[in-house]
């Protein structure tokens, strides 16, 4: 069974996102992975997309993230582009209109993306074998 190109693109996006730190990757997001035992795969993707959308909507033009140098500004714009691409592809995989995100636990965006990358790589290894 051939892996969906969307899944491949998600992994590539996550690789790009986790390769470089920006001023914003240490900010916190809701940790949906902390207690996701009874959550379906589609719900996980939907909730991950919701968290990402909340993050970039809040921090897209956040002066703390924009930085003081042209390089920092460029990297932040790239981060936002990648988060939006990831959000869109996750919604596509989830196939759900909305999903609740009400966990109290927090993690850094960096750790959130690393965890998501692990999940996506596991999914890829299953569908490509």
């Amino acid at each position: 069974h051939k892996c969906d190109i969307t899944l491949q693109e998600i992994i590539k996006t996550l690789n790009s996102l986790t390769e470089q730190k920006t001023l914003c990757t240490e900010l916190t997001v809701t940790d949906i992975f902390a207690a996701s035992k009874n959550t379906t795969e589609k719900e996980t993707f939907c909730r991950a997309a919701t968290v990402l959308r909340q993050f970039y909507s809040h921090h897209e033009k956040d002066t703390r993230c924009l930085g003081a140098t042209a390089q920092q500004f460029h990297r932040h714009k790239q981060l936002i582009r990648f988060l939006k691409r990831l959000d869109r592809n996750l919604w596509g995989l989830a196939g759900l209109n909305s999903c609740p995100v009400k966990e109290a636990n927090q993690s850094t965006l960096e750790n959130f993306l690393e965890r998501l990358k692990t999940i996506m790589r596991e999914k890829y290894s299953k569908c490509s074998s």
Partner: antibody, heavy 120, light 107 residues
């Protein structure tokens, strides 16, 4: 300043090939996905194809799939469109466009366009 | 493919008028919609992205709204340089698609 300049257009017979180029300057080309969009004379805009910043992912409109190939050379800051088996309906102005600074798959910088005419 | 239908197809208005152009998607696209302005013989120019975000350098008389399937572009007070053709574009999924365009003419 940020600029995209297309070249390679011209008149070509049906069934023949043409290669378009798009030279980028004024921005970090290797950090942006790129697109080709076309516009037939007197008609609306039609998205043609897209390539990731590092060339790893490519998408095509159904109308050109199997005939057109998008590629890029980041060392030369240049985007390409190889067009094979050209048809009369491929006649259009071809624009290269950069993905948006803040959002993917929108077009914030456009070239001036290059005209491709497919006619016998 | 997601189809975008713009209305009206053409529109006559005067300088100073408030103008609204609508774009309807054949299925939900969240806020993944952009608006462009194109003048004859020129490349399109990005006006609005993410349904309502104003592109840098674009006058504030342009605004966008909507989510899901219904979107609008509003020009609050038409200026002489605004007479052009306007296109909406969805980027929720591939293939990327455009509306058929709305031609804005001087009355």
């Amino acid at each position: 300043q940020v600029q995209l300049v297309e070249s390679g257009g011209g008149v070509v017979q049906p069934g023949r090939s043409l290669r378009l180029s798009c030279a980028a300057s004024g921005f970090t080309f290797s950090s942006y996905a790129m697109h080709w969009v076309r516009q037939a004379p007197g008609k609306g805009l039609e998205w043609v194809t897209f390539i990731w910043d590092d060339g790893s992912f490519k998408y095509y409109a159904e109308s050109v799939k199997g005939r057109f190939t998008i590629s890029r050379d980041n060392s030369k800051n240049t985007l390409y469109l190889q067009m094979n088996s050209l048809r009369a309906e491929d006649t259009a102005v071809y624009y290269c466009a950069r993905e948006g600074s803040w959002s993917p798959d929108i077009f914030d910088i456009w070239g001036q366009g290059t005209m491709v005419t497919v006619s016998s | 493919a997601i189809q975008l239908t713009q209305s009206p197809s053409s529109l006559s208005a005067s300088v100073g008028d408030r103008v609204t152009i609508t774009c309807r998607a054949s299925q939900g696209i969240s806020r993944a919609l952009a608006w462009y302005q194109q003048k004859p013989g020129k490349a399109p120019k990005l006006l609005i992205y993410d349904a309502s975000s104003l592109e840098s350098g674009v006058p504030s008389r342009f605004s966008g709204s909507g989510s899901g399937t219904d979107f609008t572009l509003t020009i609050s007070s038409l200026q002489p340089e605004d007479f052009a053709t306007y296109y909406c574009q969805q980027f929720n999924s591939y293939p990327i698609t455009f509306g058929q365009g709305t031609r804005l003419e001087i009355k």
